[in-house]
């Protein structure tokens, strides 16, 4: 049977707290992404700004649930209107603002 | 030490409005990831969640009585107020207020609860 | 909502012996299953969180377990100071919930 959302989204945030939780070394060896803007449309940009991080193992279950939010196919070099204009920010700090974004959301009540 | 202290007012009028207060010592509700819940239990029954209030002022309700309840908090008193309107004598109750802390995973576990206090609706 | 429901409501045990609790949820509550404890006249307290995390100043005969829909708590050792009624509490899905609770005497 399909996972409910508030399910969804709560394995979404756990798994971004195993992340945060358990990064020793630089997360994905301090690659930058793309920062994003979290009010509007936030699964697909974060997706489309993941995207663009290969061979980080520790992020790879991040982009396949983020997939699984997004109504359509992202592809890496993929331009969204939602990025933030010219600012790069490190992988880690992108998984740490997305987390807090990402549980607000839930204890709203905002699940899709 | 983290204490939570309720007052209400014992004995309420069915139809009335039903206000409770719970004071927080020992930790600010201005802190994040700090909530606080409501909870009821009828004299000799199990136990009833009411609402939720996090830091931010995010408030979540029990659907069954959504519309008869409101929660708030006055942050530089360190309280929260808990109103229930058109009360009827099935309210009658030990009201708890409690703190919940999501720290990393969201867990809504009640860590620390205060000693309750009995209200009765009667005529 | 997930309804909670614990077996058995009552139980008595003689000190020294080994409780179980059971509590099972009407859905997968992802272990994020609370067990408190309330004796009489006074407000719950917190036991177990997150199925088997042990709150601070509980004593080590309290444990829980399970995942899914099916939770235990066990007191490996009765002692006199744990007659009180246990409720399990599913903090996964709001509204929160309750179960009807397992009241422990002494034999």
């Known amino acids: 049977s399909p996972v409910p959302p508030s399910t969804a989204l709560k394995e979404l945030i756990e798994e971004l707290v195993n992340i945060t939780q358990n990064q020793k070394a630089p997360l994905c060896n301090g690659s930058m992404v793309w920062s994003i803007n979290l009010t509007a449309g936030v699964y697909c940009a974060a997706l489309e700004s993941l995207i663009n991080v290969s061979g980080c193992s520790a992020i790879e279950k991040t982009q396949r649930m983020l997939n699984g939010f997004c109504p359509h196919k992202v592809s890496a070099g993929q331009f969204s209107s939602l990025r933030v204009r010219d600012t790069k920010i490190e992988v880690a700090q992108f998984v740490k603002d997305l987390l807090v974004h990402l549980k607000k959301l839930f204890r709203e009540g905002q699940f899709n | 030490e983290v204490t939570l202290r309720e007052s209400g007012p014992g004995l309420v009028k069915p139809t009335q409005t039903l206000t409770l207060t719970c004071t927080l010592y020992g930790f600010s509700l201005s802190t994040s990831d700090m909530g606080v819940d409501w909870i009821r239990q009828p004299p000799g029954k199990g136990l009833e969640w009411l609402a939720h209030?996090?830091?931010?002022?995010?408030?979540r309700y029990n659907p069954a009585l959504k519309s008869r309840l409101t929660i708030s908090k006055d942050t530089s008193k360190n309280q929260v107020v808990l109103k229930l309107t058109s009360v009827d004598p099935v309210d009658t109750a030990t009201y708890y207020c409690a703190r919940t802390v999501s720290s990393g995973y969201i867990y809504y576990a009640m860590d620390y609860w205060g000693q309750g206090t009995l209200v009765t609706v009667s005529s | 909502d997930i309804q909670m429901t614990q077996s058995p409501s009552s139980l008595s045990a003689s000190v020294g012996d080994r409780v179980t609790i059971s509590c099972r949820a009407s859905?997968?509550?992802?272990?994020?299953l609370n067990w408190y404890q309330q004796k009489p006249g006074k407000a719950p307290k917190l036991l177990i969180f997150y199925t088997s995390k042990l709150h601070s100043g509980v004593p080590s005969r309290f444990s829980g377990s399970g995942s899914g829909t099916d939770y235990t708590l066990t007191i490996s050792s009765l002692q006199p100071e744990d007659i009180a009624t246990y409720y399990c509490q599913q903090g996964n899905t709001l509204p929160l919930t309750f179960g009807g609770g397992t009241k422990v005497e002494i034999k």
């Open positions: 859905q997968d509550i992802r272990n994020y």
């Open positions: 209030i996090w830091w931010d002022d995010v408030k």
